[in-house]
Protein backbone atom coordinates (compact mmCIF):
# COMPACT_ATOMS: atom_id res chain seq x y z
CA UNK A 1 0.00 0.00 0.00
CA UNK A 2 2.68 2.48 -1.31
CA UNK A 3 1.40 5.93 0.80
CA UNK A 4 2.60 8.27 -2.30
CA UNK A 5 3.00 8.51 -6.43
CA UNK A 6 6.21 9.55 -7.20
CA UNK A 7 7.06 12.08 -9.74
CA UNK A 8 10.66 10.16 -9.35
CA UNK A 9 12.16 6.89 -8.72
CA UNK A 10 12.70 6.20 -5.24
CA UNK A 11 13.94 2.70 -5.68
CA UNK A 12 17.31 1.75 -3.66
CA UNK A 13 20.16 3.05 -5.88
CA UNK A 14 24.18 3.00 -5.69
CA UNK A 15 24.81 4.74 -2.39
CA UNK A 16 27.42 7.24 -2.03
CA UNK A 17 31.06 6.36 -0.25
CA UNK A 18 30.58 6.13 3.30
CA UNK A 19 32.46 9.05 4.46
CA UNK A 20 29.53 10.93 6.51
CA UNK A 21 27.92 7.54 8.25
CA UNK A 22 29.04 5.34 10.92
CA UNK A 23 28.64 2.14 9.18
CA UNK A 24 29.26 -0.33 11.83
CA UNK A 25 27.11 -1.09 14.72
CA UNK A 26 28.04 1.17 17.74
CA UNK A 27 31.10 0.10 20.38
CA UNK A 28 29.89 -1.32 23.49
CA UNK A 29 31.51 -0.35 26.13
CA UNK A 30 31.24 -2.48 29.23
CA UNK A 31 31.80 -0.97 33.04
CA UNK A 32 30.66 -2.49 36.37
CA UNK A 33 29.08 -0.61 38.83
CA UNK A 34 32.13 1.73 40.71
CA UNK A 35 34.48 1.33 37.81
CA UNK A 36 36.19 4.43 35.99
CA UNK A 37 35.56 4.26 32.12
CA UNK A 38 37.19 6.60 29.55
CA UNK A 39 36.40 6.81 26.15
CA UNK A 40 37.94 8.30 23.17
CA UNK A 41 36.42 10.15 20.59
CA UNK A 42 37.34 8.73 16.96
CA UNK A 43 36.79 11.05 15.03
CA UNK A 44 39.83 13.19 12.90
CA UNK A 45 40.53 17.02 12.56
CA UNK A 46 38.24 17.97 15.35
CA UNK A 47 38.19 21.62 15.99
CA UNK A 48 35.38 21.30 18.74
CA UNK A 49 34.06 17.96 20.25
CA UNK A 50 30.55 18.63 21.75
CA UNK A 51 29.09 14.79 23.50
CA UNK A 52 25.38 13.82 23.76
CA UNK A 53 23.84 10.88 26.39
CA UNK A 54 20.31 9.98 25.26
CA UNK A 55 20.32 12.90 22.70
CA UNK A 56 20.55 15.41 25.06
CA UNK A 57 24.03 17.44 25.65
CA UNK A 58 26.10 15.82 28.35
CA UNK A 59 28.50 18.26 29.79
CA UNK A 60 30.97 18.22 32.65
CA UNK A 61 29.92 17.38 36.49
CA UNK A 62 31.66 16.09 39.16
CA UNK A 63 31.76 12.25 38.05
CA UNK A 64 31.93 13.12 33.91
CA UNK A 65 35.09 14.80 32.57
CA UNK A 66 35.37 15.93 28.98
CA UNK A 67 38.80 16.40 28.70
CA UNK A 68 40.08 17.12 24.27
CA UNK A 69 38.77 14.01 22.54
CA UNK A 70 38.51 12.33 26.15
CA UNK A 71 35.42 11.75 27.99
CA UNK A 72 35.88 9.90 31.49
CA UNK A 73 33.15 8.89 33.59
CA UNK A 74 34.52 8.21 37.04
CA UNK A 75 32.54 5.43 39.44
CA UNK A 76 30.28 4.49 36.75
CA UNK A 77 26.30 3.91 38.08
CA UNK A 78 23.82 1.96 35.94
CA UNK A 79 22.18 5.84 35.13
CA UNK A 80 25.48 6.24 32.90
CA UNK A 81 24.38 3.15 30.36
CA UNK A 82 23.09 4.51 27.44
CA UNK A 83 24.16 6.06 23.71
CA UNK A 84 26.82 8.22 23.62
CA UNK A 85 27.60 10.24 20.54
CA UNK A 86 30.36 12.71 19.88
CA UNK A 87 30.42 15.78 16.98
CA UNK A 88 33.36 17.55 15.93
CA UNK A 89 32.48 20.37 14.44
CA UNK A 90 34.78 21.77 11.76
CA UNK A 91 34.33 25.17 9.25
CA UNK A 92 33.09 23.09 6.95
CA UNK A 93 31.40 20.57 8.43
CA UNK A 94 30.08 17.92 11.04
CA UNK A 95 30.66 14.83 12.09
CA UNK A 96 29.29 12.33 14.75
CA UNK A 97 30.66 9.20 16.15
CA UNK A 98 27.99 7.24 18.63
CA UNK A 99 28.77 4.40 21.49
CA UNK A 100 26.97 2.67 24.44
CA UNK A 101 27.73 2.29 27.23
CA UNK A 102 26.64 -0.62 29.56
CA UNK A 103 26.95 -0.45 33.54
CA UNK A 104 26.14 -3.88 34.45
CA UNK A 105 26.93 -6.96 36.69
CA UNK A 106 25.55 -8.77 34.23
CA UNK A 107 28.24 -11.85 33.86
CA UNK A 108 29.60 -12.59 31.15
CA UNK A 109 29.02 -15.92 29.55
CA UNK A 110 31.35 -18.84 30.92
CA UNK A 111 32.00 -17.19 33.93
CA UNK A 112 30.93 -18.83 36.98
CA UNK A 113 29.34 -16.94 39.81
CA UNK A 114 31.11 -13.97 40.83
CA UNK A 115 29.94 -13.25 44.06
CA UNK A 116 32.48 -12.79 46.43
CA UNK A 117 30.00 -11.15 49.34
CA UNK A 118 27.02 -13.70 48.80
CA UNK A 119 27.97 -15.12 52.57
CA UNK A 120 27.31 -11.48 53.85
CA UNK A 121 24.05 -11.41 51.51
CA UNK A 122 22.41 -14.67 53.68
CA UNK A 123 21.70 -13.04 56.72
CA UNK A 124 20.92 -15.06 59.94
CA UNK A 125 18.89 -13.15 62.26
CA UNK A 126 18.68 -14.04 65.94
CA UNK A 127 15.82 -17.13 66.16
CA UNK A 128 14.01 -14.82 69.07
CA UNK A 129 13.35 -11.65 66.70
CA UNK A 130 10.67 -12.73 64.04
CA UNK A 131 10.92 -10.34 61.10
CA UNK A 132 9.20 -9.90 57.78
CA UNK A 133 11.39 -10.15 54.59
CA UNK A 134 13.48 -7.17 53.92
CA UNK A 135 16.03 -6.29 51.11
CA UNK A 136 19.72 -6.50 52.76
CA UNK A 137 20.96 -4.55 49.61
CA UNK A 138 19.22 -2.42 47.40
CA UNK A 139 22.48 -1.11 45.64
CA UNK A 140 22.56 -4.42 43.76
CA UNK A 141 18.88 -3.85 42.67
CA UNK A 142 18.94 -0.10 41.18
CA UNK A 143 19.37 -1.25 38.01
CA UNK A 144 15.69 -2.39 36.75
CA UNK A 145 16.60 -2.29 32.84
CA UNK A 146 18.92 -4.88 31.42
CA UNK A 147 19.85 -4.68 28.03
CA UNK A 148 22.47 -7.58 27.11
CA UNK A 149 23.75 -8.88 23.79
CA UNK A 150 22.54 -12.41 22.71
CA UNK A 151 24.06 -15.13 23.92
CA UNK A 152 25.84 -13.37 27.26
CA UNK A 153 24.82 -14.90 30.96
CA UNK A 154 22.34 -12.79 32.73
CA UNK A 155 21.98 -12.51 36.70
CA UNK A 156 19.20 -11.04 38.62
CA UNK A 157 19.70 -10.88 42.61
CA UNK A 158 17.22 -9.99 44.87
CA UNK A 159 19.61 -9.91 48.06
CA UNK A 160 17.03 -10.16 51.10
CA UNK A 161 16.97 -10.92 54.62
CA UNK A 162 13.97 -12.00 57.17
CA UNK A 163 13.31 -14.60 60.01
CA UNK A 164 12.57 -17.37 59.36
CA UNK A 165 14.69 -17.00 56.59
CA UNK A 166 11.97 -16.36 53.21
CA UNK A 167 12.21 -18.56 50.77
CA UNK A 168 12.93 -17.07 46.99
CA UNK A 169 10.84 -17.61 43.70
CA UNK A 170 10.94 -16.32 40.37
CA UNK A 171 8.13 -15.19 37.57
CA UNK A 172 8.14 -14.18 33.98
CA UNK A 173 6.12 -11.86 33.07
CA UNK A 174 3.99 -12.17 36.25
CA UNK A 175 3.38 -16.59 36.05
CA UNK A 176 5.62 -18.98 37.30
CA UNK A 177 8.91 -19.45 35.30
CA UNK A 178 9.69 -22.93 34.95
CA UNK A 179 13.19 -24.36 33.74
CA UNK A 180 10.80 -25.79 30.84
CA UNK A 181 10.45 -22.66 29.60
CA UNK A 182 14.04 -21.58 28.09
CA UNK A 183 15.96 -24.00 26.55
CA UNK A 184 19.04 -24.68 29.00
CA UNK A 185 17.07 -23.39 31.94
CA UNK A 186 18.12 -21.50 34.56
CA UNK A 187 20.28 -21.58 37.92
CA UNK A 188 18.91 -20.33 41.04
CA UNK A 189 21.29 -19.56 43.60
CA UNK A 190 19.10 -19.22 46.85
CA UNK A 191 22.65 -18.46 49.19
CA UNK A 192 23.25 -15.52 46.70
CA UNK A 193 19.42 -14.78 46.22
CA UNK A 194 20.26 -14.83 42.51
CA UNK A 195 18.69 -16.48 38.54
CA UNK A 196 21.29 -16.57 36.45
CA UNK A 197 19.91 -17.43 32.47
CA UNK A 198 23.11 -18.29 30.30
CA UNK A 199 23.34 -18.10 26.22
CA UNK A 200 20.58 -15.36 26.44
CA UNK A 201 17.69 -15.16 23.00
CA UNK A 202 15.40 -12.82 22.21
CA UNK A 203 12.85 -14.99 23.41
CA UNK A 204 14.01 -14.63 27.18
CA UNK A 205 13.08 -10.58 26.99
CA UNK A 206 10.07 -10.18 29.37
CA UNK A 207 9.98 -9.04 33.12
CA UNK A 208 11.83 -10.73 35.73
CA UNK A 209 10.07 -10.94 39.61
CA UNK A 210 11.83 -12.13 42.26
CA UNK A 211 8.90 -13.14 45.03
CA UNK A 212 10.81 -13.27 48.56
CA UNK A 213 8.16 -14.47 51.40
CA UNK A 214 8.04 -15.72 54.71
CA UNK A 215 5.44 -16.58 56.98
CA UNK A 216 5.41 -12.70 58.06
CA UNK A 217 5.37 -11.15 54.55
CA UNK A 218 6.16 -11.31 51.13
CA UNK A 219 8.07 -8.51 48.76
CA UNK A 220 9.48 -8.44 45.29
CA UNK A 221 11.25 -6.86 42.58
CA UNK A 222 10.85 -6.54 39.19
CA UNK A 223 13.66 -6.56 36.20
CA UNK A 224 13.07 -5.92 32.40
CA UNK A 225 15.33 -8.23 30.56
CA UNK A 226 16.03 -6.77 26.77
CA UNK A 227 18.20 -9.19 24.62
CA UNK A 228 20.16 -7.32 22.10
CA UNK A 229 20.29 -8.90 18.91
CA UNK A 230 23.52 -8.65 16.67
CA UNK A 231 22.21 -8.11 13.70
CA UNK A 232 22.08 -5.27 11.46
CA UNK A 233 19.50 -2.62 11.53
CA UNK A 234 17.56 0.24 9.41
CA UNK A 235 18.99 3.44 9.51
CA UNK A 236 18.46 5.68 12.78
CA UNK A 237 17.67 9.55 12.37
CA UNK A 238 18.54 12.23 14.78
CA UNK A 239 15.61 13.42 16.61
CA UNK A 240 14.49 16.99 15.42
CA UNK A 241 15.92 17.23 12.55
CA UNK A 242 15.66 18.51 9.83
CA UNK A 243 14.55 21.48 11.49
CA UNK A 244 11.44 23.71 10.76
CA UNK A 245 12.72 27.00 9.07
CA UNK A 246 11.99 30.45 7.83
CA UNK A 247 13.28 33.15 5.22
CA UNK A 248 12.62 36.04 3.14
CA UNK A 249 11.85 35.20 -0.95
CA UNK A 250 15.08 35.39 -2.12
CA UNK A 251 17.32 33.91 0.35
CA UNK A 252 18.68 30.66 1.08
CA UNK A 253 17.87 27.82 3.98
CA UNK A 254 19.84 24.62 4.37
CA UNK A 255 17.75 21.50 6.11
CA UNK A 256 20.08 18.58 7.68
CA UNK A 257 19.30 15.19 8.39
CA UNK A 258 21.87 13.25 10.44
CA UNK A 259 22.06 9.80 9.70
CA UNK A 260 23.22 6.68 11.97
CA UNK A 261 23.14 3.79 9.93
CA UNK A 262 25.14 0.24 10.63
CA UNK A 263 24.82 -0.70 6.48
CA UNK A 264 25.47 1.83 3.77
CA UNK A 265 22.51 4.17 3.53
CA UNK A 266 20.76 5.75 0.56
CA UNK A 267 19.21 9.52 1.43
CA UNK A 268 16.69 11.24 -0.55
CA UNK A 269 15.67 14.56 -0.38
CA UNK A 270 11.43 14.57 -1.14
CA UNK A 271 8.58 17.53 -1.57
CA UNK A 272 4.80 17.62 -2.33
CA UNK A 273 4.80 19.06 -5.67
CA UNK A 274 2.30 19.53 -8.14
CA UNK A 275 1.72 17.41 -11.39
CA UNK A 276 -1.17 18.95 -14.53
CA UNK A 277 -2.13 21.37 -11.58
CA UNK A 278 -3.20 18.75 -9.29
CA UNK A 279 -1.32 17.95 -6.02
CA UNK A 280 -2.53 14.35 -5.99
CA UNK A 281 -2.64 11.42 -8.36
CA UNK A 282 -5.59 9.54 -9.95
CA UNK A 283 -5.23 6.99 -6.85
CA UNK A 284 -5.69 9.93 -4.25
CA UNK A 285 -1.84 9.66 -3.22
CA UNK A 286 0.23 12.97 -2.95
CA UNK A 287 2.68 13.45 -6.08
CA UNK A 288 6.56 13.53 -4.62
CA UNK A 289 9.81 14.70 -6.33
CA UNK A 290 13.27 13.21 -5.36
CA UNK A 291 15.11 17.02 -4.63
CA UNK A 292 18.32 15.24 -4.14
CA UNK A 293 19.47 11.34 -3.21
CA UNK A 294 23.08 9.96 -2.20
CA UNK A 295 24.83 9.00 -5.27
CA UNK A 296 28.45 9.55 -7.33
CA UNK A 297 27.66 12.80 -8.41
CA UNK A 298 26.02 13.95 -5.35
CA UNK A 299 28.04 15.95 -2.11
CA UNK A 300 26.76 15.61 1.55
CA UNK A 301 23.67 14.21 0.87
CA UNK A 302 22.82 15.00 4.64
CA UNK A 303 22.47 18.70 3.63
CA UNK A 304 19.82 19.84 1.38
CA UNK A 305 20.37 23.64 0.44
CA UNK A 306 18.14 25.40 -1.17
CA UNK A 307 19.56 28.76 -2.99
CA UNK A 308 17.20 32.30 -3.65
CA UNK A 309 13.45 30.16 -2.61
CA UNK A 310 10.99 31.17 -3.93
CA UNK A 311 7.15 31.27 -2.20
CA UNK A 312 6.77 27.95 -4.19
CA UNK A 313 9.21 26.35 -2.49
CA UNK A 314 7.35 26.78 1.12
CA UNK A 315 5.95 23.28 1.96
CA UNK A 316 7.71 20.02 3.62
CA UNK A 317 10.54 18.52 2.87
CA UNK A 318 11.03 15.20 3.60
CA UNK A 319 14.36 12.92 4.72
CA UNK A 320 14.15 9.49 3.72
CA UNK A 321 16.83 6.88 4.41
CA UNK A 322 17.10 3.79 3.56
CA UNK A 323 19.47 0.67 3.50
CA UNK A 324 18.78 -3.06 2.66
CA UNK A 325 17.38 -3.66 6.11
CA UNK A 326 14.72 -0.84 6.06
CA UNK A 327 13.66 2.72 5.77
CA UNK A 328 12.94 6.04 8.19
CA UNK A 329 12.11 9.34 7.17
CA UNK A 330 11.54 12.76 9.07
CA UNK A 331 10.29 16.22 7.59
CA UNK A 332 10.36 19.82 7.85
CA UNK A 333 8.36 22.88 6.62
CA UNK A 334 9.88 25.76 4.95
CA UNK A 335 8.04 28.86 5.22
CA UNK A 336 8.86 31.42 3.19
CA UNK A 337 7.87 35.34 3.99
CA UNK A 338 7.53 38.00 2.21
CA UNK A 339 10.72 40.79 1.20
CA UNK A 340 10.00 42.83 3.99
CA UNK A 341 9.26 40.35 7.38
CA UNK A 342 12.76 39.61 9.03
CA UNK A 343 13.78 36.57 8.91
CA UNK A 344 13.96 33.88 11.87
CA UNK A 345 14.61 29.74 12.34
CA UNK A 346 12.31 28.17 14.11
CA UNK A 347 13.05 26.77 17.34
CA UNK A 348 15.22 23.06 16.52
CA UNK A 349 13.69 20.50 18.82
CA UNK A 350 15.97 18.25 20.73
CA UNK A 351 14.68 15.23 22.04
CA UNK A 352 16.26 11.78 22.42
CA UNK A 353 16.78 9.36 19.43
CA UNK A 354 14.17 6.95 18.69
CA UNK A 355 15.41 3.52 19.23
CA UNK A 356 13.74 1.54 16.32
CA UNK A 357 13.21 -2.29 15.57
CA UNK B 1 10.62 -15.32 17.39
CA UNK B 2 10.90 -14.26 14.08
CA UNK B 3 9.64 -16.63 11.19
CA UNK B 4 9.24 -16.84 7.49
CA UNK B 5 6.77 -19.11 6.19
CA UNK B 6 6.92 -19.54 2.42
CA UNK B 7 3.73 -21.29 0.49
CA UNK B 8 4.25 -24.93 -0.71
CA UNK B 9 5.92 -26.24 -3.97
CA UNK B 10 4.44 -25.29 -7.44
CA UNK B 11 4.58 -27.55 -10.69
CA UNK B 12 4.07 -24.75 -13.70
CA UNK B 13 3.98 -25.00 -17.08
CA UNK B 14 5.87 -22.80 -19.46
CA UNK B 15 3.86 -18.99 -20.25
CA UNK B 16 2.59 -19.78 -16.83
CA UNK B 17 2.33 -17.32 -13.83
CA UNK B 18 3.31 -18.23 -10.02
CA UNK B 19 2.18 -16.30 -6.68
CA UNK B 20 4.31 -17.52 -4.05
CA UNK B 21 3.27 -16.15 -0.75
CA UNK B 22 5.55 -15.23 2.38
CA UNK B 23 4.12 -14.79 5.92
CA UNK B 24 5.84 -13.21 8.28
CA UNK B 25 5.71 -13.29 12.64
CA UNK B 26 7.62 -12.42 15.49
CA UNK B 27 8.09 -8.71 14.86
CA UNK B 28 7.01 -5.36 13.72
CA UNK B 29 6.37 -6.10 9.60
CA UNK B 30 6.22 -2.77 8.31
CA UNK B 31 9.79 -2.11 10.26
CA UNK B 32 11.99 -4.31 7.16
CA UNK B 33 12.31 -4.96 3.60
CA UNK B 34 11.28 -8.55 2.51
CA UNK B 35 14.15 -9.56 -0.13
CA UNK B 36 13.60 -12.66 -3.00
CA UNK B 37 16.44 -15.02 -3.54
CA UNK B 38 15.91 -17.73 -5.81
CA UNK B 39 18.60 -20.62 -6.68
CA UNK B 40 18.17 -22.83 -9.99
CA UNK B 41 18.89 -26.64 -9.03
CA UNK B 42 22.85 -27.05 -8.25
CA UNK B 43 23.52 -23.26 -8.73
CA UNK B 44 24.24 -20.34 -6.83
CA UNK B 45 22.15 -17.08 -5.16
CA UNK B 46 20.33 -14.50 -7.16
CA UNK B 47 18.90 -11.88 -6.05
CA UNK B 48 15.24 -11.08 -7.33
CA UNK B 49 14.11 -7.89 -5.48
CA UNK B 50 12.62 -6.58 -2.50
CA UNK B 51 9.58 -4.50 -0.79
CA UNK B 52 9.03 -2.12 1.72
CA UNK B 53 6.05 -3.47 4.02
CA UNK B 54 5.37 0.30 5.33
CA UNK B 55 4.86 2.16 2.21
CA UNK B 56 4.98 -0.39 -0.87
CA UNK B 57 8.43 0.60 -2.14
CA UNK B 58 10.21 -1.76 -4.11
CA UNK B 59 13.30 -2.69 -5.87
CA UNK B 60 14.43 -4.99 -8.39
CA UNK B 61 16.59 -6.86 -10.42
CA UNK B 62 16.77 -5.32 -14.14
CA UNK B 63 16.45 -8.94 -14.66
CA UNK B 64 13.24 -9.65 -13.66
CA UNK B 65 11.69 -6.17 -13.91
CA UNK B 66 9.41 -7.10 -16.38
CA UNK B 67 7.89 -10.55 -15.27
CA UNK B 68 8.10 -10.22 -11.13
CA UNK B 69 5.69 -8.44 -9.04
CA UNK B 70 6.27 -8.03 -5.26
CA UNK B 71 3.26 -7.09 -3.06
CA UNK B 72 3.09 -6.75 0.61
CA UNK B 73 -0.71 -7.58 2.58
CA UNK B 74 -0.01 -5.85 6.05
CA UNK B 75 -3.29 -6.81 7.42
CA UNK B 76 -1.65 -10.46 7.17
CA UNK B 77 1.58 -9.80 7.21
CA UNK B 78 2.36 -11.29 4.18
CA UNK B 79 4.43 -10.54 0.93
CA UNK B 80 3.78 -12.25 -2.22
CA UNK B 81 6.15 -12.54 -5.51
CA UNK B 82 4.84 -13.12 -8.79
CA UNK B 83 6.69 -14.64 -11.71
CA UNK B 84 5.17 -14.36 -15.07
CA UNK B 85 5.94 -15.58 -18.82
CA UNK B 86 7.74 -18.54 -16.77
CA UNK B 87 10.19 -20.90 -18.96
CA UNK B 88 12.18 -23.77 -17.78
CA UNK B 89 15.09 -21.56 -16.64
CA UNK B 90 12.70 -20.18 -13.88
CA UNK B 91 12.73 -23.85 -12.17
CA UNK B 92 14.38 -22.78 -8.66
CA UNK B 93 13.80 -22.48 -4.76
CA UNK B 94 12.64 -19.61 -4.32
CA UNK B 95 13.32 -18.38 -1.05
CA UNK B 96 12.23 -15.11 1.29
CA UNK B 97 14.22 -13.08 3.49
CA UNK B 98 13.79 -10.90 6.17
CA UNK B 99 16.91 -7.91 5.16
CA UNK B 100 18.93 -11.20 4.75
CA UNK B 101 19.20 -11.76 8.23
CA UNK B 102 16.02 -14.26 8.58
CA UNK B 103 15.19 -16.52 5.89
CA UNK B 104 11.94 -18.62 4.90
CA UNK B 105 12.32 -22.21 4.23
CA UNK B 106 12.12 -22.24 0.42
CA UNK B 107 9.55 -22.68 -2.07
CA UNK B 108 10.37 -24.86 -4.89
CA UNK B 109 9.25 -23.99 -8.36
CA UNK B 110 8.88 -26.66 -10.95
CA UNK B 111 8.40 -25.56 -15.04
CA UNK B 112 7.80 -28.15 -17.12
CA UNK B 113 5.72 -28.54 -20.69
CA UNK C 1 25.87 -4.51 -11.65
CA UNK C 2 28.35 -5.47 -9.18
CA UNK C 3 30.37 -8.95 -9.63
CA UNK C 4 31.33 -10.71 -6.54
CA UNK C 5 34.37 -13.54 -7.11
CA UNK C 6 34.68 -16.02 -4.96
CA UNK C 7 38.09 -18.18 -4.53
CA UNK C 8 38.06 -20.94 -4.14
CA UNK C 9 35.22 -22.73 -5.40
CA UNK C 10 35.76 -25.86 -3.71
CA UNK C 11 38.21 -27.28 -1.03
CA UNK C 12 38.84 -30.08 1.16
CA UNK C 13 39.27 -29.89 4.61
CA UNK C 14 40.00 -31.58 7.92
CA UNK C 15 38.09 -31.34 11.56
CA UNK C 16 40.69 -28.61 13.20
CA UNK C 17 41.80 -27.15 10.22
CA UNK C 18 41.91 -23.45 9.83
CA UNK C 19 40.22 -21.97 6.54
CA UNK C 20 39.75 -18.96 4.39
CA UNK C 21 37.43 -18.15 1.80
CA UNK C 22 38.06 -14.85 -0.27
CA UNK C 23 35.69 -12.53 -1.89
CA UNK C 24 36.33 -10.10 -4.34
CA UNK C 25 34.08 -6.99 -5.60
CA UNK C 26 34.46 -5.49 -8.91
CA UNK C 27 34.27 -2.33 -7.25
CA UNK C 28 34.96 -0.60 -3.80
CA UNK C 29 31.73 -1.70 -1.59
CA UNK C 30 33.21 -0.22 0.78
CA UNK C 31 32.33 -2.62 4.03
CA UNK C 32 28.65 -3.35 2.54
CA UNK C 33 29.60 -7.36 2.21
CA UNK C 34 27.91 -10.21 4.59
CA UNK C 35 28.77 -13.65 4.05
CA UNK C 36 26.41 -16.54 4.19
CA UNK C 37 26.22 -20.50 4.85
CA UNK C 38 24.21 -22.84 3.27
CA UNK C 39 24.15 -26.65 3.71
CA UNK C 40 22.10 -28.89 1.11
CA UNK C 41 18.11 -28.32 1.11
CA UNK C 42 18.13 -25.58 3.48
CA UNK C 43 17.90 -21.49 3.36
CA UNK C 44 21.18 -19.61 3.97
CA UNK C 45 22.05 -18.71 7.27
CA UNK C 46 23.47 -15.28 7.72
CA UNK C 47 27.27 -15.19 9.45
CA UNK C 48 28.71 -12.21 9.25
CA UNK C 49 27.54 -8.96 8.28
CA UNK C 50 28.93 -5.53 7.62
CA UNK C 51 31.75 -7.37 6.73
CA UNK C 52 33.51 -7.62 9.94
CA UNK C 53 30.44 -8.47 12.71
CA UNK C 54 29.30 -11.65 13.67
CA UNK C 55 25.21 -12.27 13.28
CA UNK C 56 23.26 -13.63 16.26
CA UNK C 57 24.33 -17.16 17.09
CA UNK C 58 26.84 -17.58 15.16
CA UNK C 59 30.08 -19.53 16.63
CA UNK C 60 33.14 -17.19 17.35
CA UNK C 61 35.61 -19.44 15.35
CA UNK C 62 34.04 -17.69 12.51
CA UNK C 63 35.26 -14.02 11.83
CA UNK C 64 35.52 -11.83 8.35
CA UNK C 65 37.89 -9.11 7.60
CA UNK C 66 38.27 -6.82 5.09
CA UNK C 67 37.03 -3.86 2.74
CA UNK C 68 37.01 -2.03 -0.44
CA UNK C 69 37.21 -4.54 -2.79
CA UNK C 70 38.81 -7.51 -0.64
CA UNK C 71 37.23 -9.51 1.88
CA UNK C 72 37.80 -12.68 3.78
CA UNK C 73 36.03 -15.28 5.95
CA UNK C 74 37.82 -17.15 8.07
CA UNK C 75 37.24 -20.16 10.02
CA UNK C 76 39.59 -20.74 12.85
CA UNK C 77 38.93 -24.99 14.26
CA UNK C 78 37.11 -26.09 11.45
CA UNK C 79 34.00 -28.04 13.25
CA UNK C 80 32.04 -31.48 11.53
CA UNK C 81 29.09 -29.23 11.36
CA UNK C 82 30.47 -26.29 9.02
CA UNK C 83 30.63 -28.50 6.08
CA UNK C 84 28.80 -26.23 3.95
CA UNK C 85 28.47 -24.24 1.12
CA UNK C 86 29.60 -20.56 1.92
CA UNK C 87 28.12 -17.30 -0.30
CA UNK C 88 29.78 -13.76 -0.07
CA UNK C 89 26.97 -10.78 -1.30
CA UNK C 90 27.23 -6.97 -1.85
CA UNK C 91 24.81 -5.00 -0.11
CA UNK C 92 25.82 -1.74 -1.04
CA UNK C 93 23.53 -1.35 -3.88
CA UNK C 94 21.07 -2.82 -5.93
CA UNK C 95 21.01 -5.58 -7.48
CA UNK C 96 22.59 -6.95 -4.10
CA UNK C 97 24.85 -9.74 -6.34
CA UNK C 98 26.17 -13.05 -4.22
CA UNK C 99 29.45 -14.94 -4.76
CA UNK C 100 29.88 -17.84 -7.05
CA UNK C 101 30.30 -19.96 -3.11
CA UNK C 102 32.82 -22.05 -2.14
CA UNK C 103 31.96 -25.23 -0.94
CA UNK C 104 34.05 -26.70 2.02
CA UNK C 105 33.86 -30.50 1.77
CA UNK C 106 35.42 -33.02 4.07
CA UNK C 107 39.25 -34.04 3.70
Known amino acids: RPSFSLVEDTTLEPEEPPTKYQISQPEVYVAAPGESLEVRCLLKDAAVISWTKDGVHLGPNNRTVLIGEYLQIKGATPRDSGLYACTASRTVDSETWYFMVNVTDAISSGDDEDDTDGAEDFVSENSNNKRAPYWTNTEKMEKRLHAVPAANTVKFRCPAGGNPMPTMRWLKNGKEFKQEHRIGGYKVRNQHWSLIMESVVPSDKGNYTCVVENEYGSINHTYHLDVVERSPHRPILQAGLPANASTVVGGDVEFVCKVYSDAQPHIQWIKHVEKNGSKYGPDGLPYLKVLKHSGINSSNAEVLALFNVTEADAGEYICKVSNYIGQANQSAWLTVLPKQQAPGREKEITASPDYLE | QVQLVQSGAEVKKPGASVKVSCKASGYIFTNYYIHWVRQAPGQGLEWMGA????????SYNQRFKVRATLTADTSTSTVYMELSSLRSEDTAVYYC??????WGQGTTVTVSS | DIQMTQSPSSLSASVGDRVTITCRASENIYGALNWYQQKPGKAPKLLIYGATNLADGVPSRFSGSGSGTDFTLTISSLQPEDFATYYCQNVLSTPYTFGGGTKVEIK
Open chain 2, 51 to 58: IYPDNGDT
Open chain 2, 97 to 102: ARAFTY
